[in-house]
């Protein structure tokens, strides 16, 4: 696996946080510059899950 090293040192452009197209259960992680499994949030007062939006005071679900 180590042979497929991501050369992050040479790819630190300012667009590193621009998301690529990920599938429905994933999101783009700028740290690893790839799509990763992404969890939804749990809104304590409603019990609903949602995508995290800026400014919302949500807590993540316990564990995964």
């Amino acid at each position: 696996m180590g042979a497929r090293r991501l050369r992050v040192r040479s790819q630190r452009s300012r667009d590193s946080s621009v998301p690529t197209q990920c599938n429905q259960t994933e999101c783009f992680d700028p740290l690893v510059r790839n799509c990763v499994s992404c969890e939804l949030f749990h809104t304590p007062d409603t019990g609903h899950t949602s995508s995290l939006e800026p400014g919302t005071a949500l807590q993540p679900q316990e564990g995964s």
């Epitope: 590193s16 946080s17 992680d29 690893v32 990763v36 499994s37 969890e39 995508s51 995290l52």
Partner: antibody, heavy 125, light 107 residues
Framework: EVQLVESGGGLVQPGGSLRLSCAAS????????IHWVRQAPGKGLEWVAW????????DYADSVKGRFTISADTSKNTAYLQMNSLRAEDTAVYYC??????????????????WGQGTLVTVSS | DIQMTQSPSSLSASVGDRVTITCRAS??????VAWYQQKPGKAPKLLIF???YLYSGVPSRFSGSGSGTDFTLTISSLQPEDFATYYC?????????FGQGTKVEIK
């Protein structure tokens, strides 16, 4: 229950090698990045390396590059840190940790949510 | 690499005090900052991620703020179990880097 358990630490002479293991349970490592972080006695946290097992991407701290190799075996749900050419300054408690991501408008908002208990590596003659 | 400069390196406070710890990044990292608490002999625990989001199970007396280069962790009313060392970490660009830590001690 999510759990990470490190093993493989011990006493080794300068120039020697060790292989640390990080056995995960309660989640599949292929879906997250797995990180090694170390802490020298009385010092702060120092990130060492990460691996994204789903694609094999890796990165390393400059202080270990060329000496340490991070890898993962998804069939065993285990990550590894192969440490070669060890130096006295590599003496530390080594932790593995999972990076969790929450969906923030399609981009990861996250941190290292689960950590192992740590394994001590002592490099001394 | 992005440097995370944390201040103060240590502080003394009493139970009930409001405590503020700051972290400055050497370049713009948006809101990609997490805060951790560590007690002696234990692994770190995630408190805050994405600069201002409280991790599950963390008491609401902890809060985070900031974006760009300046970030703050606040403990609104210090409790006995909060005496520990706190670290910030950026995760915008690899390598992820930690601040040097802030030790919160009993006055």
């Amino acid at each position: 229950e999510v759990q990470l358990v490190e093993s493989g630490g011990g006493l080794v002479q300068p120039g020697g090698s060790l292989r640390l293991s990080c056995a995960a349970s309660g989640f599949t490592i292929s879906s997250s990045s797995i990180h090694w972080v170390r802490q020298a006695p009385g010092k702060g946290l120092e990130w060492v390396a990460w691996v994204l097992p789903s694609v094999g991407f890796t990165d390393y701290a400059d202080s270990v590059k060329g000496r340490f190799t991070i890898s993962a075996d998804t069939s065993k749900n285990t990550a590894y840190l192969q440490m070669n050419s060890l130096r006295a300054e590599d003496t530390a408690v080594y932790y593995c940790a999972r990076r969790v991501c929450y969906n923030r408008l399609g981009v990861c908002a996250g941190g290292m949510d689960y950590w192992g208990q740590g394994t001590l590596v002592t490099v001394s003659s | 690499d992005i440097q995370m400069t944390q201040s103060p390196s240590s502080l003394s406070a009493s139970v009930g005090d409001r405590v503020t710890i700051t972290c400055r990044a050497s370049e713009d990292i948006s809101t990609a900052v997490a805060w951790y608490q560590q007690k002696p002999g234990k692994a770190p625990k995630l408190l805050i991620f994405a600069a201002s989001y409280l991790y599950s199970g963390v008491p609401s007396r902890f809060s985070g703020s900031g974006s760009g280069t300046d970030f703050t962790l606040t403990i609104s009313s210090l409790q006995p179990e909060d005496f520990a060392t706190y670290y910030c970490q950026q995760s915008q660009i690899s390598p992820p880097t930690f601040g040097q830590g802030t030790k919160v001690e009993i006055k």
